[in-house]
Each structure stands twice: as C-alpha cells, then as structure tokens.
C-alpha cells in the first residue's frame, strides 16, 4: 500500500516550519509547497455569509487559534 | 469553475479490472487534490484516495492495494485502475477535486460500477 | 480510522421546521485552529453538493440557513427553516486524518 507523506497527524503534528517566499503551507500534507501548486476556487461573492477566504497557510502566519484566516490576497491564496 | 466527467463504468464479472477515467476542464490536475469517492446502491459515500499536485497517492487502506489512481497531464484526466474486482465494489464512482481543508467542492457526474456474474 | 457517527439516521419534518443534525467523531478532527469537518447534501441520483467547509464555512452559493458548528469531535449542521428542495441526505466528513471518513448519512424526510 503506497501511503502519502503524512505521518504525524492530529494532535500530533508539529507546528510547520515557516515557509519561504512563494510557498505556501498545504495544510493536507502538512509540508510547504510552491504556492501555484495549489487549486484555486472560486471567489466568494460579495456579501457571503461566511466571509473567512478559503486560504493555505501563508509564509506570515503563525499557527494556532484562526490559522488559515488569512484576509490579504497572498500569494498562497487558494 | 472545474467540470469533471466520469466514464468507463459497466459490467465486469468478480476478479475482473476496469479503468475509469475523469477528464478535468476549467483547471489543472497538476494543482490541488484529486479524488474518487464512491458509493455503494442504497449506502452512503466512501473515500477512495487521491493524486495531488506532486502525483503522490493515498488510498483508503480498506482497499487492500486493489486500486491504483494515476494521471494524464497532458489530458488533464485522472484514472482509478481497479482489480480483483468483488460484488462489494459495486457503486457509482464519482472524482472529485478539494479545498485547501479537504472539503470536495467538485464532483462528477458519476459513473456506475456492477461487478456480477 | 476516525469513525464519524451522525444521528438521527433519519428524520421526518415539515417546510419551516428548524432542523439539527449532529456528528461526533472518535477523535478530534481539529489541527492548527482549524476543523477538518465538512458537510454535503445528495439527492437521489445526484452528487453530494458541499454545504458547509471547515465546521462553519458556507460554500458558495449556498442559502444562508444553512449554518455548522462545533469543534474537537461534536459538530452540528442546523438547517433554521426548512424548505422544500432540503430534503435530502445529509452527510458529515473528516480530513483530519487519513484515510478520510463520511458519517453514514442522515436522511431529512416530509413529515
């Protein structure tokens, strides 16, 4: 059985090593990745209930309570 | 917005293989993740495993190796090779592509799967 | 494996109701201040469309009376007034850890 990469999930994750300028941390492997690797969806309309941008992990941000929320269009933006 | 149409289901007899396939529009399968989910007539939904953007796989170890998903790039299409089919995988196979959480955003059509005798 | 129970298994209301359907993991499905918890509705012959990402997210296009809570293991799908084209099953799903798991589904009936 070929596994992915991930194996420390959960719980037991370690924290990411900030990523580099251009790379953006995939949430789903839990490793940093040229951001232009990742899908892009859809924009949100204006007005959405749910205004949280649907976001990786930026180089800037820290990880903990709201990771992922970023509000800038970054470059990791997905 | 992405567009994924499933073919090459049918009829296959138990030990049989078959290869379906998911041709993608409106994006890359060189970014992002790439899914089969299927589910069985009456049951609820099963995740199959995916291909990302490195071309690394995961499959649901339920699957026991049975099942193999690979890419065209060049078709922007994903496959799901499956063998040593048995009655229990029979189930409409459907591709899906995902957010940055896992969340599947988009899916195909589906495409039946009966492995009878 | 994260086991994803949901309950009720069906249920029976009526246009206008408010409806609640809940999941609990076997173990936390949150990371990095996030909740790998999503929500899709299938109707017969159709795909799963998804509803909710990340717990509370509503994707795009979808009615804002739909909502989603929680977090660790407890989550809730509530939808605040019923409407003919909900009828529905209604299924919960993790991304926490692999492989990836769906509830077994809820079924939203008219009562």
């Known amino acids: 059985m070929r596994r992915g990469p991930r194996s420390l999930r959960g719980r037991d994750a370690p924290a990411p090593t900030p990523c580099v300028p251009a790379e953006c941390f995939d949430l789903l492997v839990r490793h940093c990745v040229a951001c232009g690797l990742l899908r892009t969806p859809r924009p949100k309309p204006a007005g959405a209930s749910s205004p949280a941008p649907r976001t990786a992990l930026q180089p800037q941000e820290s990880v903990g309570a709201g990771a992922g929320e970023a509000a800038l269009p970054l470059p990791g933006l997905l | 917005e992405v567009q994924l149409v499933e073919s090459g289901g049918g009829l296959v007899q138990p030990g049989g293989s078959l290869r379906l396939s998911c041709a993608a529009s409106?994006?890359?399968?060189?970014?992002?993740?790439w899914n089969w989910v299927r589910q069985a007539p009456g049951k609820g939904l099963e995740w199959v495993g995916y291909?990302?953007?490195?071309?690394?796989?995961y499959y649901n170890p339920s699957l026991k190796s049975r099942f193999t998903i690979s890419r065209d790039t060049s078709k922007n299409t994903l496959y799901l090779q499956m063998n040593s089919l048995r009655a229990e995988d029979t189930a409409v196979y459907y591709c899906?592509?995902?957010?940055?959480?896992?969340?599947?955003?988009?899916w195909g059509q589906g495409t039946l799967v009966t492995v009878s005798s | 494996d994260i086991q994803m129970t949901q309950s009720p298994s069906s249920l029976s209301a009526s246009v206008g109701d408010r409806v609640t359907i809940t999941c609990r993991a076997s173990?936390?499905?949150?990371?990095?201040?996030?909740?790998?918890m999503h929500w899709y509705q299938q109707k017969p012959g159709k795909a799963p469309k998804l509803l909710i990402y990340?717990?509370?997210d509503l994707e795009s296009g979808v009615p804002s009376r739909f909502s989603g809570s929680g977090s660790g293991t407890d989550f809730t799908l509530t939808i605040s007034s019923l409407q003919p084209e909900d009828f529905a099953t209604y299924y919960c799903?993790?991304?926490?850890?692999?492989?990836?798991?769906f509830g077994q589904g809820t079924k939203v009936e008219i009562k």
């Open positions: 409106g994006d890359s399968i060189t970014r992002g993740y």
């Open positions: 799903q993790q991304t926490s850890k692999d492989p990836w798991t």
């Open positions: 899906a592509t995902t957010l940055p959480y896992g969340a599947m955003d988009y």
């Open positions: 291909i990302n953007y490195s071309g690394t796989t």
């Open positions: 990340r717990a509370s």
């Open positions: 173990e936390s499905v949150d990371d990095y201040g996030i909740s790998f």
